[in-house]
Interface confidence: low
Amino acid sequence: MGRARDAILDALENLSGDELKKFKMKLLTVQLREGYGRIPRGALLQMDAIDLTDKLVSYYLESYGLELTMTVLRDMGLQELAEQLQTTKEESGAVAAAASVPAQSTARTGHFVDQHRQALIARVTEVDGVLDALHGSVLTEGQYQAVRAETTSQDKMRKLFSFVPSWNLTCKDSLLQALKEIHPYLVMDLEQS
């Protein structure tokens, strides 16, 4: 698409130093669509407009990246800049593109666990085996027992996913590793979807 990336860059380059700093701070707290990860604070605060544009596009893709940039600019009271992005969005058909592809599948730069949350809740049946693999290293005793206490596989997976927002990447990797061992064909299927 290209044009969206250029529009984001134009908008960010129009910000003063203080405004760019404020944009980054707001980006750290803005509500994200489900399935999308947050750009790490340490990296984010060091970026100039070009690096930030690249990061926005790599994390959120062009359509959602454009939308997110507009949201933050509006929140900062920079309506004019946001309107310019709105025009680009409408001209490029980004609205249709964003609406036609679910957030889960577009989050290609997100972790497998975040990308495929709904499918994993629906399709993982051997939850207890997954829990045993995560017990101690990822899940605390209380979390482990809380998931075990649920009755159906889907409820167990929902409960498990309620802990994911506080996980770091190692934890998510551990879950993926457990899934690969217990449900290899499901993981293969989702990786190719």
Partner: antibody
Framework: RVQLQQAGAELVKPGASVKVSCKAS????????IYWVKQRPGQGLEWIGR????????NYNQKFEGKATLTVDKSSGTAYMQLSSLTAEDSAVYYC??????????WGHGTSVTVSS | DIVLTQSPASLAVSLGQRATISCRAS??????????IHWYLQKPGQPPKLLIY???DLESGVPARFSGSGSGTGFTLNIHPVEEEDAATYYC?????????FGGGTKLEIK
């Protein structure tokens, strides 16, 4: 950022035990793993283990199992590490650290434990 | 356990020049595109301070003269240009599996 406060020094006799404390400021204590790290004088760093204040879930480095016991007091926002059957090898600075996301990004100033008769 | 070997054990670098520290792991500490190596500096009498996490991400507030790179088993910390205040011991640490381990440290002296 959460601040971690540790007592400066402890002098203990061989064979005795010592309980090192780590008090966290702020109300986010229950959300993060607390890690413990050992550093002998002039030496490198060794990871002892970790504890989650929400339910006292722990993981230990096998090397320190039986030597270190990690506990927390949620009401005071304090993590503890008890070291037992102390020998000269246990003389070191012991740090507590907090893992907020990827790495240990908040550290206490360390407690120096000296084992001497 | 994963063993991290740092080299050199010590180095002396002139003010304004580049310091390069290597960290080699006994097995891969990378997984699904993430590199679980972190870098810390430590000055005498102080706790370690996080500089870089996940091999290349700069911790908030750390000057941009610090940078990290690498994947798999080989990682590098670069400091350029080196400043007086960078004199310290630098450690790499992995968080790929338990137990987490640290490299033996590299002492940087400024000439």
């Amino acid at each position: 950022r959460v601040q971690l406060q540790q007592a400066g020094a402890e002098l203990v006799k061989p064979g005795a035990s010592v309980k090192v404390s780590c008090k966290a400021s702020g109300n986010t204590f229950n959300n993060y793993w607390i890690y413990w790290v050992k550093q002998r004088p002039g030496q490198g760093l060794e990871w002892i283990g970790r504890i989650h204040p929400s339910d006292s879930g722990t993981n230990y480095n096998q090397k320190f199992e039986g030597k270190a016991t990690l506990t927390v007091d949620k009401s005071s926002g304090t993590a503890y590490m008890q070291l037992s059957s102390l020998t000269a090898e246990d003389s070191a600075v012991y740090y507590c650290a907090l893992l907020s996301l990827y790495a240990m990004d908040s550290w206490g100033h360390g407690t120096s434990v000296t084992v001497s008769s | 356990d994963i063993v991290l070997t740092q080299s050199p054990a010590s180095l002396a670098v002139s003010l304004g020049q580049r310091a390069t520290i290597s960290c080699r792991a006994s097995k891969s500490v990378s997984s699904f595109g993430y590199n679980y190596i972190h870098w810390y500096l430590q000055k005498p009498g102080q706790p370690p301070k996080l500089l870089i996490y996940l091999a290349s991400d700069l911790e908030s507030g750390v000057p941009a003269r610090f940078s990290g790179s690498g994947s798999g088993t080989g990682f590098t910390l670069n400091i350029h240009p080196v400043e007086e205040e960078d004199a310290a011991t630098y450690y790499c640490q992995h968080s790929r599996e338990f137990p987490w381990t640290f490299g033996g440290g590299t002492k940087l002296e400024i000439k």
